[in-house]
């Protein structure tokens, strides 16, 4: 807290302008008068404050608007938004998407903040979904913003918004995250071409059941292993081996390095060693010959 | 502790390129300014560029204008000088320097310990 | 730019006060920071807005700036305060940094 001291002779200001950082705190206090900093906020960017002065600027807003902010004043924050809080920012109503960018530029280069997450949370609260042109600029200041994400949250996103999905946005989106994308990818690309849809869904494809990639499989799609290896487990299993091979194509061979992992290890404890003999890939662990396949699953879902 | 560490100095022929590293740590670097500040041998000091806390504003001494550009990396907590068509009188110790605020070089309250930039041929 | 000029050296008896000017026109509508440096290390900042101190900084070190004068003020002067003393300051117009050329401060 600054002590009140009254301003000195002549240090009045009448704008806003680069004199200011040569005033101390408590000049800034006495000095600079907090209706006339709301109304020329968008000058504070372009002046090369000390965060120690910027906290004296906040103090005056927070005086001037105790309740919150309004959005004129937030929009041209600047600088200033990195000395609020979360606490100060939920009393915020963010309702442009101008703001929001406006912000996220200001903390551009830095990990997301508590502060940032608390305005992304409002401004998408505040706008009900998701929709494309915000999320579009929220994975582009932050890729992995996506992924933050709940299922729950993930599931107010309008498929139309899966246009604005790049790959790198999903690396690390877990199944469950994914379970609730990839519908919404089927759909939002359901009137490409064979080619092109594998293109956008590949991505997406860790939340994909058995049968759409059975589907995948009579398309030449030649499936890559690191895309391989990020699908379900028990979307992978009932997959015979001549579907891995028409979905994996040329990228078969990769199998072999694989072994040991899941969903590969996984599905070769499933395949008869016959079959997988047919790859020539040296794969083990099938299922000898002569061995019954009993598919329990299967027996307890008719019972 | 708060800390800025540069490296990257050494003998440089005219005319020739360098490229220095200040890697910082103790403190949220994205959030500051830096300057790199260089000192010829027994010489005064001397301003010669900073960069803003995200990256998006650049300032350069007329001294150095189109020849020397200033970067940093936040992921890699690290500013970068990268110093071409180098003269003799750019011999000197190049420190980096911490303004405490977002963008600006009104004072500089952390400083690294210097290296040592010689073009001689 | 702004020039700032500084007397190139200043001698001072130990337990003495020691006074380093640095002059730069209307230096006192612009802020004045100081900073000490030791043979072979950084520059340590010891003062800025004209007469604040970091933590840290013994409270002999004192500054003061109006007109088109700086002074940097160290009362009781010690052995260790032997050091080169920079004035610095700030053109906003220019946004340029401006350094003093140094002061060797000499206890005797």
């Known amino acids: 807290e600054v002590e009140k001291t009254a301003c000195p002779s002549g240090k009045k200001a009448r704008e806003i302008d680069e004199s200011l950082i040569f005033y101390k705190k408590w000049e800034l206090e006495a000095c600079v008068d907090a209706a006339l900093l709301a109304t020329q906020m968008d000058r504070v960017n372009a002046i090369p404050f000390t965060y120690e002065q910027l906290d004296v600027l906040k103090h005056k807003l927070d005086e001037l608007y105790p309740q919150g902010y309004p959005e004129s004043v937030i929009q041209h924050l600047g600088y200033l938004f990195l000395k609020m809080s979360p606490e100060d920012i939920r009393k915020w109503n963010v309702t442009s998407l101008e703001t929001l960018k406006a912000l996220l530029e200001v903390n551009k280069g830095h990990e997301m903040s508590p502060q940032v997450a608390t305005l992304i949370d409002r401004f998408v609260k505040g706008r009900g979904q998701l929709d494309k042109d915000t999320l579009d600029t929220l994975t582009a200041f932050y890729p992995g913003y996506l992924c933050s994400l709940s299922p729950e949250e993930l599931s107010s996103v309008p498929p139309s918004s899966i246009w604005a999905v790049r790959p790198q946005d999903l690396d690390t989106c877990d199944p469950r995250q994914l379970d609730v994308l990839y519908p919404k990818a089927r759909l939002a690309f359901q009137n490409m071409n064979g080619s092109e849809y594998f293109v956008k869904i590949q991505s997406f494809l860790g939340g994909a059941p058995t049968e759409d990639l059975k589907a995948l499989s009579q398309q030449n799609v030649s499936m890559d292993l690191a895309t391989f290896m990020k699908l379900r487990t028990d979307a992978v299993l009932p997959l015979t081996v001549a579907e891995v091979q028409k979905l994996l194509g040329p990228h078969v061979e990769g199998l072999k390095a694989e072994e040991r992992h899941r969903p590969v290890r996984d599905w070769i404890l499933r395949q008869r060693q016959d079959d997988l003999d047919t790859l020539g890939l040296g794969l083990q662990g099938g299922i000898p010959n002569g061995y019954l396949v009993l598919d329990l699953s299967m027996q307890e879902a008719l019972s | 502790q708060v800390q800025l560490v540069e490296s990257g100095g050494g003998l440089v022929q005219p005319g020739g390129s360098l490229r220095l590293s200040c890697a910082a740590s103790?403190?949220?670097?994205?959030?500051?300014?830096i300057s790199w500040v260089r000192q010829a041998p027994g010489k005064g000091l001397e301003w010669v560029s900073s960069i803003s806390g995200g990256g998006s504003k650049t300032f350069y001494a007329d001294s150095v204008k189109g020849r020397f550009t200033i970067s940093r990396d936040n992921s890699k907590n690290t500013l970068y000088l990268q110093m071409n068509s180098l003269r003799a009188e750019d011999t000197a110790v190049y420190y980096c320097a911490r303004y405490p605020g977002p963008t600006g070089h009104v004072f500089f309250d952390i400083w690294g310990q210097g290296t040592l930039v010689t073009v001689s041929s | 730019d702004i020039e700032l000029t500084q007397p190139p050296s200043v001698s001072v008896a130990p337990g003495q006060t020691a006074r380093i000017s640095c002059s730069g026109d209307?230096?006192?509508?612009?802020?004045a920071t100081w900073y000490q440096q030791k043979p072979g290390q950084a520059p340590v900042l010891v003062i800025y807005y004209d007469n604040d101190r970091p933590s840290g900084i013994p409270e002999r070190f004192s500054g003061s700036n109006s007109g088109n004068t700086a002074t940097l003020t160290i009362s009781g002067t010690q052995a260790e305060d032997e050091a080169d003393y920079y004035c610095?300051?700030?053109?906003?117009?220019?946004?340029?940094?401006?350094f003093g050329g140094g002061t060797k401060l000499t206890v005797l």
């Open positions: 103790g403190f949220t670097f994205s959030r500051y300014a």
């Open positions: 209307n230096i006192g509508s612009k802020v």
């Open positions: 610095q300051s700030y053109d906003g117009q220019m946004s340029t940094s401006v």
